[in-house]
Amino acid sequence: FRDCADVFRSGLTTSGIYTLTFPNSTEETKAYCDMETGGGGWTTIQRREDGSVDFQRTWKEYKVGFGNPSGEHWLGNEFVSQLTNQQRYVLKIHLRDWEGNEAYSLYEHFYLSSEEFNYRIHLKGLTGTAGKISSISQPGNDFSTKDADNDKCICKCSQMLTGGWWFDACGPSNLNGMYYPQRQNTNKFNGIKWYYWKGSGYSLKATTMMIRPADF
């Protein structure tokens, strides 16, 4: 299977972990497929939910992925880059705060450049309930990690805010920031941030990033 849309089309319509194959390759990766949300077929590329996984990782770890697909994880920039350059994908980002509210941002077109271009993010066409302005800066930025400073700040955003992300200088989001538990989640500059939903300093309870072919 190329992605979770492929899995769904094959008749496997139960959410769970499936083995996917890199485009034009025999290399495989395991991914969580969400077969319920909005008609299913979603390949989960990131999840935060409980702080059980350390997201302050190296470039190589963000490249290949880490964590457990059934829990907190990062699928891997290389796989996502290759996949999203095969055809047009949409990106859905689902967010939960500590007060029981949920919101989402949906981008009509999403892809990552290759590693040569630092897995730069490309986004078009924002809709959803998590802000009228994109919390991932447009035009998209290069990916940065604690050992690869590709941001637009004289500081080192990834070291300062923790986690790998498409930092600007440093920008209005970081879904890979420090996980803060309830009642410790406000006034945190380095938390799990989506500015145009919750404003500055609010660290979210849970996030999911997932992709699906635009023609699904």
């Epitope: 009509e108 077109h109 490309h122 986004l123 078009k124 066409g125 924002l126 009228k132 302005i133 447009q138 035009p139 998209g140």
Partner: antibody
């Protein structure tokens, strides 16, 4: 902003026509876009907007019959066709990304209507 | 069309002053109000939208408030780079309309 660049302004006689262009970065492909104008020393005035595929157009009623908005997504370009121009149409014309409010603006192009 | 009555049309203030600009809409606007800053020869720059939501890069001294028909832009401590013209805009109804602007000048 280098992501929105207007062109096509200039001097035109009353009753004449002009087509303004706005070259847009490709990440605006799925966004509503607007034209906003500003007469010399005056305030801002919304001209009209167009949806991503060009299927929905909203024009300020005062410009209906004279101005037309269009876009060509294959060229990443927004247009404002202005006919029957009057002296009071003299202004800097801006293109902007329209989210209801305007969060990205071009640098503007000056249109002068004078005999 | 909705009329946006913006006051004052101009004001003189010193660095460090607190500045307040108001806009009154001719109809209920549901907080669908934005504020812009414009400097001579430049395009307007969005500061605030949805009545009170500050754009990320905008300094914290800028804030927006209001409801129903009445909205306010406040600059808590005026800085040299804040001398400019400010506009409100409603986007609740077509046609979108702007206030006439407030020019903030150095005293």
């Amino acid at each position: 902003s280098e992501h929105l660049v207007e062109s096509g302004g200039g001097l035109v006689k009353p009753g004449g026509s002009l087509r303004l262009s706005c070259a847009t970065a490709d990440f605006f492909e799925y966004d509503d876009m607007s034209w906003v104008r500003q007469a010399p020393g005056k305030g801002l005035e919304w001209v009209g907007s167009i949806s991503p595929k060009g299927d929905h157009k909203y024009l300020n009623t005062k410009f209906i019959g004279r101005f037309t908005i269009s876009r060509d997504d294959s060229k990443n370009t927004l247009y404002l066709q202005m006919n029957s121009l009057r002296a009071e149409d003299t202004a800097v014309y801006y293109c902007a990304r329209d989210v209801g409010f305007f969060d990205w603006w071009g640098q503007g192009t000056l249109v002068t209507v004078s005999s | 069309a909705i009329y946006m009555h913006q006051e004052p049309s101009s004001l003189s203030a010193s660095v460090g002053d607190r500045v307040t600009i108001t806009c009154h809409g001719s109809y209920w606007l549901n907080s669908e109000v934005a504020w812009y800053q414009q400097k001579p020869g430049k395009a307007p720059k969005l500061l605030i939208f949805d009545g009170d939501f500050k754009v990320y890069e905008v300094p914290s001294r800028f804030s927006g408030s209001g409801s129903h028909e009445d909205y306010t832009l406040t600059i808590s401590s005026l800085q040299p780079e804040d001398f400019a013209t400010y506009y409100c805009q409603q986007y609740r109804y077509h046609p979108y309309t702007f206030g006439h602007g407030t020019k903030v000048e150095i005293k």
